[in-house]
Interface confidence: low
């Protein structure tokens, strides 16, 4: 009976330990479930954050591209130079400069070239109207970029293109032959042929910078 | 002894159960520790992601502001109008238009006003040099915005400011009195006083649009 009592006491102890252990397991199970839930929440949070980060990265990339484009556009436009340099007249697609010095045709041509321009070329009646108006208050002759070697040659512009016959009639020394060639000048709205060696004012012309207008 | 055997058997069972439970607890403890570690890692990941997201948001905000600024600048510059309208000459801070019609001083003044401009005002010797050069190939007179009621009055520009005496000497009919007043014109580089009722060419002037240059 002493053995029996001892065994009963041990049994009670073991039962108590077992119950305690079972309680611990139950608590741990609950904690584990809670931990699992928390972990799932954390994983979900991570997923959300990762998605948000990915979205932000996409948006940022887009903004960055926009920025680059804007900077590029700005680079093109910001120093958006005027259509024409100072002292030139801007008309339609061209810039015109009325020289303030008097030189022979070749020297006048050189002067224009040094300004990245050519002597006046008249392409249309509208061009002619503008030039006639622009020099209406001058009685002086102005060289234009039109010349020919001698009367048997055609009238050619500096770029080698021929004069359109309907534009204007050339008056003056049309049948004369000069060693330096025959050049055309415009005076009071009419165009005249003259010895290229004579000094006259001139009109330079170049394309207007209309990119950003 | 039968009771003792039974108790021994129960004890063995309980010990076995206890050992099993202890094993379970140990396993759960390890799992919990692993879970805790994993959770810590997840939390760390969340922290990292949150920080990254915050940084991205800051960057994005910055890019957004940059974008807005660029768009604003572009708005100001993109339609960057030319310093001067077509057919005008841009020189320094001003635009100049040499009229192609001949009118009296008052009518010339009206024509300039209709173009949002005024008759020529010469503020400096540099202005005078430019104008002298610009009209060097004309023998015609050009009205400027300078006039006086009669010889006992001072010469005044259109804006009411007086003529600086060092700029130029006025020649011609300076001591004449005209019913319409005495007006100044520039011709071949010199300035003359004349009856305002005479018809002449004129020079209009307005501020150049240099915002984006």
């Amino acid at each position: 009976s002493q053995v029996s009592n001892l065994l009963k006491q041990q049994q009670t102890n073991l039962t108590h330990q077992k119950n305690k252990l079972e309680g611990q397991i139950s608590a741990r199970q609950q904690a584990e479930e809670a931990s699992q839930e928390s972990q799932n929440e954390l994983k979900e949070m991570i997923e959300t954050l990762a998605w948000k980060l990915n979205e932000k990265s996409k948006e940022q990339m887009e903004l960055h591209h926009q920025n680059l484009n804007l900077q590029e556009t700005l680079k093109r436009v910001a120093n958006c130079s005027a259509p024409c340099p100072q002292d030139w007249i801007w008309h339609e697609e061209n810039c015109y400069l009325f020289s303030t010095g008097s030189f022979n045709w070749e020297k006048s041509q050189e002067k224009c070239l040094s300004l990245d321009a050519k002597l006046l070329k008249i392409n249309s009646t509208a061009d002619l109207d503008f030039i006639q108006q622009a020099i209406s208050y001058s009685s002086f002759p102005f060289w234009m970029g039109l010349s020919r070697r001698n009367p048997s040659y055609p009238w050619l512009w500096e770029d080698g293109s021929p004069l359109m016959p309907h534009l204007f009639r050339i008056r003056g020394a049309v049948s004369q032959t000069y060693p330096s060639g025959t050049c055309a000048y415009i005076q009071r709205g009419a165009v005249y042929a003259e010895n290229c060696i004579l000094a006259a004012f001139s009109i330079c012309q170049k394309k207007a910078n209309l990119r950003a207008q | 002894s039968q009771v003792s055997n039974l108790l021994k058997q129960q004890q063995t069972n309980l010990t076995h159960q206890k050992n099993k439970l202890e094993g379970q607890i140990s396993a759960r403890q390890q799992a919990e520790e692993a879970s805790q570690e994993s959770q810590n890692e997840l939390k760390e990941m969340i922290e990292t992601l949150a920080w990254k997201l915050n940084e991205k948001s800051k960057e994005q905000m910055e890019l957004h502001h940059q974008n807005l600024n660029l768009q604003e600048t572009l708005k100001r510059v993109a339609n960057c109008s030319a310093p001067c309208p077509q057919d005008w000459i841009w020189h320094e801070e001003n635009c100049y238009l040499f009229s192609t019609g001949s009118f009296n001083w008052e009518k010339s003044q009206e024509k300039c006003l209709s173009l949002d401009a005024k008759l020529l005002k010469i503020n400096s010797t540099a202005d005078l040099d430019f104008i002298q050069q610009a009209i060097s190939y004309s023998s015609f007179p050009f009205w400027m915005g300078l006039s006086r009621r009669n010889p006992s009055y001072p010469w005044l520009w259109e804006d009411g400011s007086p003529l600086m005496p060092h700029l130029f000497r006025i020649r011609g009919a300076v001591s004449q009195t005209y019913p319409s007043g005495t007006c100044a014109y520039i011709q071949r580089g010199a300035v003359y006083a004349e009856n305002c009722i005479l018809a002449a060419f004129s020079i209009c002037q307005k501020k150049a649009n240099l915002r984006a240059q």
Partner: antibody, heavy 115, light 107 residues
Framework: QVQLVQSGAEVKKPGASVKVSCKAS????????VHWVRQAPGQGLEWMGA????????AYVQKFQGRVTMTRDTSTSTAYMELSSLRSDDTAVYYC????????WGQGTLVTVSS | DIQMTQSPSSVSASVGDRVTITCRAS??????LVWYQQKPGKAPKLLIY???SLQSGVPSRFSGSGSGADYTLTISSLQPEDFATYYC?????????FGQGTKLEIK
């Protein structure tokens, strides 16, 4: 005071050229155009053209275009008028004058064209 | 070219007389007109510019008027030194053309 002094009288054969000079003093030569006017014996005044001494630019009457050349030498304040392929009806007094209206005139140079 | 026509081509008058010479342009010249006086063997002398402005040093008996295409030179009281030929000239546009002249002779 302002003065324009012209070169002396010339006698030329038809087909020849004549160059008349006009020396200016008493004002800034480059500031004022120099005009050339001629007057045939017993006739009226005829404007031939002008030169802008500052730039050297010249304007000629169409009638004389190709025969007349107006030049200047700013170092001596002198304007020149050269008329080529002379004919008998070019016989005239040739005047230089300053500016428009022509406020100062040279004394005139008689050019006689005769074979 | 603008044609300038003076009338009369000659006029006889006495000292103290009032004399009027007219000049007509073939088109309006906006008062850009001058009058010159020329004596035999001499260069012309500027009297009036801009139709009515008296050149400095010219006696006030000389006056100019007119507008559009019609202009007048008036000598209010003829003096012996005024007998000469008078020319008008337009200077609106090149070629700057002269009138044919009006010879003022002693009656």
């Amino acid at each position: 005071q302002v003065q324009l002094v012209q070169s002396g009288a010339e006698v030329k054969k038809p087909g020849a050229s004549v160059k008349v000079s006009c020396k200016a003093s008493g004002y800034t030569f480059t500031d004022y155009e120099v005009h050339w006017v001629r007057q045939a014996p017993g006739q009226g005044l005829e404007w031939m053209g002008a030169i802008h001494p500052g730039s050297g630019g010249a304007a000629y009457v169409q009638k004389f275009q190709g025969r007349v050349t107006m030049t200047r030498d700013t170092s001596t304040s002198t304007a020149y008028m050269e008329l080529s392929s002379l004919r008998s009806d070019d016989t005239a007094v040739y005047y230089c004058a300053r500016w428009l209206p022509m406020d100062y005139w040279g004394q005139g140079t008689l050019v006689t064209v005769s074979s | 070219d603008i044609q300038m026509t003076q009338s009369p081509s000659s006029v006889s008058a006495s000292v103290g007389d009032r004399v009027t010479i007219t000049c007509r342009a073939s088109q309006g010249i906006n008062n850009w007109l001058v009058w010159y006086q020329q004596k035999p063997g001499k260069a012309p002398k500027l009297l009036i510019y801009a139709a009515s402005s008296l050149q400095s040093g010219v006696p006030s008996r000389f006056s100019g008027s007119g507008s559009g295409a019609d202009y007048t030179l008036t000598i209010s009281s003829l003096q012996p030194e005024d007998f000469a030929t008078y020319y008008c000239q337009q200077y609106l546009i090149t070629p700057y053309t002269f009138g044919q002249g009006t010879k003022l002779e002693i009656k």
